[in-house]
């Protein structure tokens, strides 16, 4: 759903023309063009990590990064390349929250976002290639899906405190990354704006050497950059205990089999337990729906098992220093 | 972006057979359940049948079964709904979506109660 608009290629003053006003003033909207040219595509995030603590789990946030409002979502997990998944929880906002085992709660965090817990009976080894989807339907547009997982080697039972890092979700440095883009292009264009200052102004015509003349991509500031800043998130504290898919759930179980250790989940604290606290050398799996991929390590806030809504505390200061964790 | 496209409809007599194909990509296919339900000419939408993620699980409306049969291949991320001995009261167009409608029951169904959902692909039965 990402709009696209050709911007016109500056061609040089023909001899004889003078930079009038007229000509000026053309300049304005089209820089204007390009900084809002496009409409953010809808994209959803995935985080995957799993916590050490008594009892064995996962904790898996995602979010829906896009417009439209969401008219359904569907959790899922399995092994590596997509091998026996099986639903989780299928949340709808209007009809209801259905789960099945291992899932232990299912739960909306935002209009955006959703949370799952899934416990088990605690086993020693963590689920390995074991992969989370998360996909958010948002009627008629469409629907996208991310996935994630934990590292192999992720030990649940890391002794040492983990070392703090500044982390960025990858679907946020996209949309910074292209701001970045996006401001330093304006910067230079204004630059040129001011070289040409007192010369006649280009005149602006779409460019004849090509059918196609170079398309601008860029998320719109208006929407994109605020919604970066103001992230929903869900957080699904999994535990891998299938065992429990094939007995349980309605529509049979994967044929694979691990085990993960899960952990009591916690009542979500105030803005200041995010303040300054570690976030796990290992982090999770976080993909975007295009398929980037990038590691997290950040330790998302445990979640109670209260049904109540909360937004993210951190409010809009969200991405100064690293992502708070508990 | 998920993508759910059908093919194999079209006009049959009868008493015969149709097989409707669904390719799914942009998500994960062997991780869903994925149904396909119809609506008739001025009707609602009606759920016709359902497969669990790793086609253990089958199930079907009452006026289809056992003519009606739903496989999927997840290598090729594909379903498919086989049709035998059509009947008149089958022709509908047909969406192949993703979800089973009995997680939040079959009153009402509309295509935004599945996290997927295809274009559609017309089945018409006349003689």
């Known amino acids: 759903m990402r709009t696209e608009a050709q911007v016109p290629a500056l061609q040089p003053p023909e001899p004889g023309l003078e930079g009038a006003m007229g000509h000026r003033t053309l300049v304005l909207p089209w820089v204007l063009l390009t900084l809002c040219v496009t409409a953010g595509t809808p994209e959803v995030w995935v985080q995957v990590r799993m916590e050490a603590t008594e009892l064995s789990s996962f904790t898996i946030r995602c979010g829906f990064l896009g417009s439209g409002s969401i008219s359904l979502v569907t959790v899922s997990w399995g092994g590596p390349n997509g091998a026996g998944g099986t639903t989780l929880a299928v949340l709808h906002p209007e009809r209801g929250i259905r789960q099945w085992a291992p899932a232990r709660q299912a739960r909306w965090e935002t209009q955006s976002s959703i949370s799952l817990i899934l416990e088990g009976s605690g086993a020693s080894s963590p689920c390995a290639n074991t992969t989370f989807c998360c996909k958010f339907a948002s009627f008629p547009e469409g629907s996208w899906e991310a996935c994630g997982s934990l590292p192999p080697s992720s030990d649940p039972g890391l002794s040492a405190p983990p070392t703090p890092a500044p982390i960025l979700r990858a679907d946020l440095a996209g949309i910074l990354g292209v701001s970045g883009v996006l401001l330093f292009g304006c910067v230079y264009l204004l630059h040129l704006l001011r070289r040409h200052k007192h010369r006649p102004a280009p005149r602006l015509q779409p460019s004849r050497t090509s059918p196609q003349a170079p398309r601008a991509r860029a998320w719109a500031p208006s929407q994109a950059s605020q919604a970066a800043l103001h992230v929903p998130y869900a957080t699904i504290n999994t535990s891998c205990r299938p065992a429990t898919l094939d007995t349980a759930h309605p529509h049979g179980g994967p044929s694979w089999w691990a085990s993960l250790p899960t952990h009591a989940a916690h009542r979500p604290q105030g803005p200041a337990a995010w303040a300054s606290t570690p976030i796990p050398a290992r982090g999770s799996f976080v993909s975007v729906e295009n398929g980037l991929y990038a590691q997290a390590g950040e330790r998302p806030p445990h979640t109670g098992p209260g049904l109540t809504l909360f937004p993210d505390p951190r409010g809009p200061r969200a991405m100064e220093g690293p992502l708070g964790v508990r | 972006e998920v993508q759910l496209v059908e093919s194999g409809g079209g006009l049959v007599q009868p008493g015969g057979s149709l097989r409707l194909s669904c390719a799914a990509s942009?998500?994960?296919?062997?991780?869903?359940?994925m149904s396909w339900v119809r609506q008739a000419p001025g009707k609602g939408l009606e759920w016709v049948s359902t497969i669990n993620s790793n086609a253990g699980r089958t199930s079907y409306v009452d006026s289809v079964k056992g003519r009606f049969t739903i496989s999927r291949d997840n290598s090729k991320n594909t379903l498919y709904l086989q049709m035998n001995s059509l009947r008149a009261e089958d022709t509908a167009v047909y969406y192949c979506?993703?979800?089973?409608?009995?997680?939040?029951?079959?009153?009402?169904?509309?295509?935004?109660?599945?996290?997927?959902w295809g274009q559609g692909t017309m089945v018409t039965v006349s003689s």
């Open positions: 942009g998500f994960t296919f062997s991780y869903y359940d």
């Open positions: 979506v993703e979800g089973d409608p009995h997680n939040f029951g079959l009153e009402s169904l509309s295509l935004r109660d599945f996290g997927s």
